[in-house]
């Protein structure tokens, strides 16, 4: 008799999820000498242990603690780049500027990037059919709790000047409900972080507006200032040119003409 299976509103676990996580772990630890000591089988076991046999609407940060412990990693605390709704450009940037790090440049972020996963209560099966959607089903699902946990830890580790890349093409450039707005902003440590510098990325070729004056940016500035952290904002009018000029700052096309 086929077992009844809970139908969730979100997509199911990414196909070949265990193999993908294990392969990514092996690749990451080969590329990053400081993480060579990591045992990827243990990492997978800890990852699996966080959600297998558990109700996918009842996951806690505590469930991920064994994985967090195994994935402990020190990144230079003054070289952190946060992002919101503009992941691809943030990753392109850290590929060029190799001494800066997004969450997805760390082992745990790299393992889970773009993947979905969930299990079922009381069975050891992975659910490849559907997983809970954050809005329609529940917020304490395996994926959301994972990202909340690693994002909080990443923000807590930051120091000095922290940078955040924001999407200037969206109606809410700063969104209080994003992971950045709901988790990272509130977990920056004022005793360690001097300044949050926002980079507002412009989409339009001819867009010369000062998006640092946008009401949502002013809201971000207010939240940050109340937390005793200085705030700074830059308009990145030409993101393609910005990446090119980060690569080669001496290129004459990077300097304003007199």
């Amino acid at each position: 008799v086929p077992r009844w299976r809970q139908q969730w509103s979100g997509p199911g676990t990414t196909k070949r999820f265990p193999e993908t996580v294990l392969a990514r772990c092996v690749k990451y630890t080969e590329i990053h000498p400081e993480m060579r000591h990591v045992d990827c089988q243990s990492v997978w076991d800890a990852f699996k242990g966080a959600f297998i046999s558990k109700h996918p609407c009842n996951i806690t940060e505590e469930d991920y603690q064994p994985l967090m412990k195994l994935g402990t990693q020190t990144v230079p605390c003054n070289k952190i780049l946060l992002w919101s709704r503009i992941k691809d450009l943030a990753h392109q940037f850290t590929q060029v500027q190799r001494d800066m790090f997004t969450l997805e440049d760390t082992l745990l972020g790299y393992l889970a990037d773009d993947l979905t996963w969930c299990g079922e209560f009381n069975t050891s099966k992975i659910n490849y059919q559907s997983c809970p959607d954050w809005r329609k089903d529940c917020s304490n699902n395996p994926v959301s709790v994972f990202w909340k946990t690693v994002s909080r830890r990443f923000a807590e580790a930051a120091c000095d000047v922290v940078h955040v890349m924001l999407n200037g093409s969206r109606s809410k450039i700063f969104d209080k409900n994003s992971t950045f707005g709901s988790v990272e902003v509130h977990n920056l440590q004022p005793e360690k972080v001097q300044t949050l510098e926002a980079w507002v990325i412009h989409g339009g070729r001819e867009d010369s507006r000062d998006l640092c004056q946008d009401p949502t940016i002013k809201e971000l500035e207010s939240i940050i200032s109340k937390r005793n952290i200085q705030f700074s904002c830059k308009n990145i009018y030409r993101p393609d040119k910005f990446l090119q000029c980060v690569k080669n700052p001496e290129d004459s096309s990077c300097t304003s003409e007199i």
Epitope: S232, I236, C245, P249
Partner: nanobody, 115 residues
Framework: DVQLQASGGGSVQAGGSLTLSCRYS?????????MGWYRQAPGNQRELIAT????GKTNYKDSVQRFIISRNDTTVTLQMNRLQPEDTAVYYC???????????WGQGTRVTVSS
């Protein structure tokens, strides 16, 4: 909040010298972007008069070849030699990048040259 504040202005006789200074914070954009000195004479638009790249490559408006722009990790400096009355203006420092917009403009520093 203003991250760029020019200082060092004042009144000087024609032929004299002044050195303007501008500190900026440790954000990444300043570290990788060209910086510039701008000036705004009474009744005129603000104009870019000198730029310097991260590596120290400089460029000047023809009329200010007497000036020398320099920078380190936190400061951009403008050494103004053989000053003339037409150099009277408010001077500002800011980014001089084709990719990144100018930062919030500070108060600037006033230079007055009398003949």
């Amino acid at each position: 909040d203003v991250q760029l504040q020019a200082s060092g202005g004042g009144s000087v006789q024609a032929g004299g010298s002044l050195t303007l200074s501008c500190r900026y914070s440790g954000g990444f954009v300043f570290r990788v972007s060209s910086m510039g000195w701008y000036r705004q004479a009474p009744g005129n638009q603000r104009e870019l008069i000198a730029t310097i790249t991260v590596g120290g490559k400089t460029n000047y408006k023809d009329s200010v070849q007497r000036f020398i722009i320099s920078r380190n990790d936190t400061t951009v400096t403008l050494q103004m030699n053989r000053l003339q009355p037409e150099d009277t203006a408010v001077y500002y420092c800011n980014l001089a990048s084709t990719a990144v917009g100018a930062d919030t403009w500070g108060q600037g520093t006033r230079v007055t040259v009398s003949s």
